[in-house]
Amino acid sequence: VTGSRVYPANEVTLLDSRSVQGELGWIASPLEGGWEEVSIMDEKNTPIRTYQVCNVMEPSQNNWLRTDWITREGAQRVYIEIKFTLRDCNSLPGVMGTCKETFNLYYYESDNDKERFIRENQFVKIDTIAADESFTQVDIGDRIMKLNTEIRDVGPLSKKGFYLAFQDVGACIALVSVRVFYKKCPLTVRNLAQFPDTITGADTSSLVEVRGSCVNNSEEKDVPKMYCGADGEWLVPIGNCLCNAGHEERSGECQACKIGYYKALSTDATCAKCPPHSYSVWEGATSCTCDRGFFRADNDAASMPCTRPPSAPLNLISNVNETSVNLEWSSPQNTGGRQDISYNVVCKKCGAGDPSKCRPCGSGVHYTPQQNGLKTTKVSITDLLAHTNYTFEIWAVNGVSKYNPNPDQSVSVTVTTNQAAPSSIALVQAKEVTRYSVALAWLEPDRPNGVILEYEVKYYEKDQNERSYRIVRTAARNTDIKGLNPLTSYVFHVRARTAAGYGDFSEPLEVTTNTVPSRIIGDGANST
C-alpha cells in the first residue's frame, strides 16, 4: 500500500520507500549483522522505514541490501534518488582504519520478479556514493538529521524490470528514502494540439519526436509536432491547429462562441460580438441572424452590420416645362445603415378624369442621366405627352431592398404637362423694420396656376448687387428676416412654387434697416 506523495509532473515514480506502509522487507545479505530495517519518526511523527548498517569496527565489510523487483513500465532510462545520512567516522570512537564513508549502488536487469537470493556477480555497479560536503538539515523528531540526496541514472534498460542493490563496505549509514523514477514529458496542449504523455529517450541527449493531435473543435493548419527532451521538458513546438468556425481558443481549448458572439472562419481570431442589428441564440455560431426588418446582402461579410432598406426620399420637387419635367429630391432620413444607396424613377401616365387609372409610361419617355440606379438626387424626364397627368415615383434603394417584403421607400408627385408655373407676386411689403430684422408680407400671385406649395424669399445687400444672396422658404405669406446689419440697404424678391415649379420673382423691394431701436412701420413696396 502506498501513500500519495507529490512529485514533479514529469516524473513517474516506480518505487518510493517513503510511501510504503509497513515493512519494506528487502533482502539483506548476510541475513543478520548487516543491513537492518529500522523505523524512525519523521518531522510529522510518522514512522519512516529505513535501512541502516554501522559495522565500523571490522574491516572488509561486504553487506548487501537488495530491493524488490521494480517494473520499468517502458522506460529506457531510470533515475535513482537516494536520501541517506552518513555518520562521520570521526564521531565514532576507535574505528579509524575500519570505518568508511561511502557505499556502492548496483542494478541487475531481470524479467523474473521473484528472485530470492542476491547473486553479487549479476549486479552491475552504477556508482560509488559519498556524502556531499553540503548536507540538508532535516528535522527527524526533535533531532536534526543531516540528510544527503544523491541522484544517479541508468540506461538503456531493456528487460521487464530490475533490482537495485546497496553494498556497504564499512560505513555507518542509514538509507532514509529510495525513490526510483523515470522522466516523461507530461500530456500537454500547445498551439491547440494535444501531445500525449511521452517517455523520454534512452540517452541523456536524445529527443523524441511526437506528433500532436488537434484538440476538439479545431483543425490542423500545419502539422503539429514537438520534441520530448531527456529531462522531461517539451521542446521546439512546430505547426499548430486553429479553432473551427464558431469556436475560439480559451484556456488551451477550442470553446464554442458564447451566445451573442460568432466566428465565421477557422482562424486564430477570437469570437466577435454579433454586428449591430444581429444576434445569435445558440453557442458556436458561425454567423449572426439579422434582427427582424434587417438584412444582409449576398456580398456583405459576416462581420458587417445587418442593414435595412432606406426610408423614402424627402422634399421631392418637380418643375414642368412643356413636355419635360425636372425632378429634385433630398436623401432619405434613414439610409438603412448602408452606403450603396441609389434611386429608381417610376413614371405612370394617368387619366385626367380618374387619376387612379394609371399605366406605365412606356419606352418613349427618356430619362437623364438614367431611370434606374441614379446616384444623384435629380433627374430630367423628356418626351412626355402634352396636357397629360403624370405620376412620378422616386424609389430609394440599397443592397438589401430586394429582401424587403413591404416596400415603402418611395415618394411621388403628380404633374400635368404644360401646366404654367405661378405668376409673379405683385405686392411685397415691409411690415416692420428694426435694426436687425425686416418683417415681410405679400399677396398670393394673381394666377397661382395650381396649389402654392411654398414661397421663396431671396435677399441681399444692395451694394452686393446679387453677388451674395440668401434664400428663405416658407409656406406662409409672410416671414421675418432676421440677422441683418443695421443701417444697411437690402433688396428682397419673392416667388411662389406649385407642383409645376417656381414662378418668376417679384419686383425688388428695397428696405434700409434702422440705426435706432425704435421700429419703423412701412407698407409701401419701397420703404427706405
Epitope: G33, E58, M145, C172
Partner: antibody
C-alpha cells in the same frame, strides 16, 4: 539469538583478584565493541569503559584505571574484566554490554545477566 | 565530564496514566542519548537510542524526544510491567549515566 553469558557470583577477600568472563554468541564477536558497567548495591549504573573487540584496544572511564583491565579471547568470543587488589567498595554487580553504534546514535543493546562480586574479609 | 541529571527521582503513577521523565545534560550531547529500563534483579534493557529511535521489540508506548541538553522519555499509558528504574546515558568522550528515575505504582 544474540546473548551475553556471564559467570556466577564471586566472593573475594580484600587484596585478591577476580576475572569475570563474558561469552558472546549469536553474532560476530569482533563486529561489536564490549562495554563494562558496575552497579553497587542499591545504586545506579556506573560506566567503567569499553574495549574494541576487533583491535583489542581498551578505553577506561575515570576512576577505573590501574586496577581494572579489559581483555579478549576472540577464539572463544569472550571478553574479560579483571580487577586486582580488590577493595570492599568494589562490591557490586558487574555487567558486560554489547555496544551498538548506529547512524542515529549509540547504545548498549545486549546485556549480560551480571556477575555479583562481593569483597569481604 | 558531562553530568546527567534526571528528574524526578521518583515518579508515582497509576496504570494507564502518562509518565514523563526528564534528563538534563550539563552541556550539549547532540542527540546521542539512549534510555534504559531496569527492573529489580535484572540487567538493564535498551529502550531508546539516538534520542528517539526504538530498537526492535520495544512497545510504541515508549517515545523520547529532545536534543542538545534537554531530553524527555514518555510512557503514553503505563502498563504494570513498566514499573522500574529508568536511566539516560550520554556518549561523549566519556560515557556517563544519569542517577535514574524510579517509576512506582501510585
Amino acid at each position: 539469538q544474540v546473548q551475553l553469558l556471564q559467570s556466577g557470583a564471586e566472593v573475594k577477600k580484600p587484596g585478591a583478584s577476580v576475572k569475570v568472563p563474558c561469552k558472546a554468541s549469536g553474532y560476530t564477536f569482533t563486529s561489536r565493541a564490549m562495554s563494562w558497567v558496575r552497579q553497587a548495591p542499591g545504586q545506579g549504573l556506573e560506566w567503567m569503559g569499553w574495549i574494541n573487540t576487533n583491535t583489542g584496544n581498551p578505553t577506561y572511564a575515570q576512576g577505573f584505571t590501574g586496577r581494572f583491565v579489559f581483555s579478549l579471547d576472540t577464539s572463544v568470543s569472550t571478553a574479560y574484566l579483571q580487577i586486582s587488589s580488590l577493595k570492599a567498595e568494589d562490591t557490586a554487580v558487574y555487567y558486560c554490554a554489547r555496544v551498538r553504534f548506529t547512524v542515529y546514535g549509540d547504545g548498549m543493546d545486549v546485556w549480560g545477566q551480571g556477575t555479583l562480586v562481593t569483597v569481604s574479609s | 565530564e558531562i553530568v546527567l541529571t534526571q528528574s524526578p527521582a521518583t515518579l508515582s503513577v497509576s496504570p494507564g496514566e502518562r509518565a514523563t521523565l526528564s534528563c538534563r545534560a550539563s552541556q550539549s550531547v547532540s542527540s546521542n542519548l539512549p534510555w534504559y529500563q531496569q527492573k529489580p534483579g535484572q540487567a538493564p534493557r535498551l529502550l531508546i537510542y539516538g534520542a528517539s529511535t526504538r530498537p526492535t521489540g520495544i512497545p510504541d508506548r515508549f517515545s523520547a524526544s529532545g536534543s542538545g541538553t534537554d531530553f524527555t522519555l514518555t510512557i503514553s499509558r503505563v502498563e504494570p510491567e513498566d514499573f522500574a528504574v529508568y536511566y539516560c546515558q550520554q556518549y561523549g568522550p566519556s560515557w556517563t549515566f544519569g542517577q535514574g528515575t524510579k517509576v512506582e505504582i501510585k
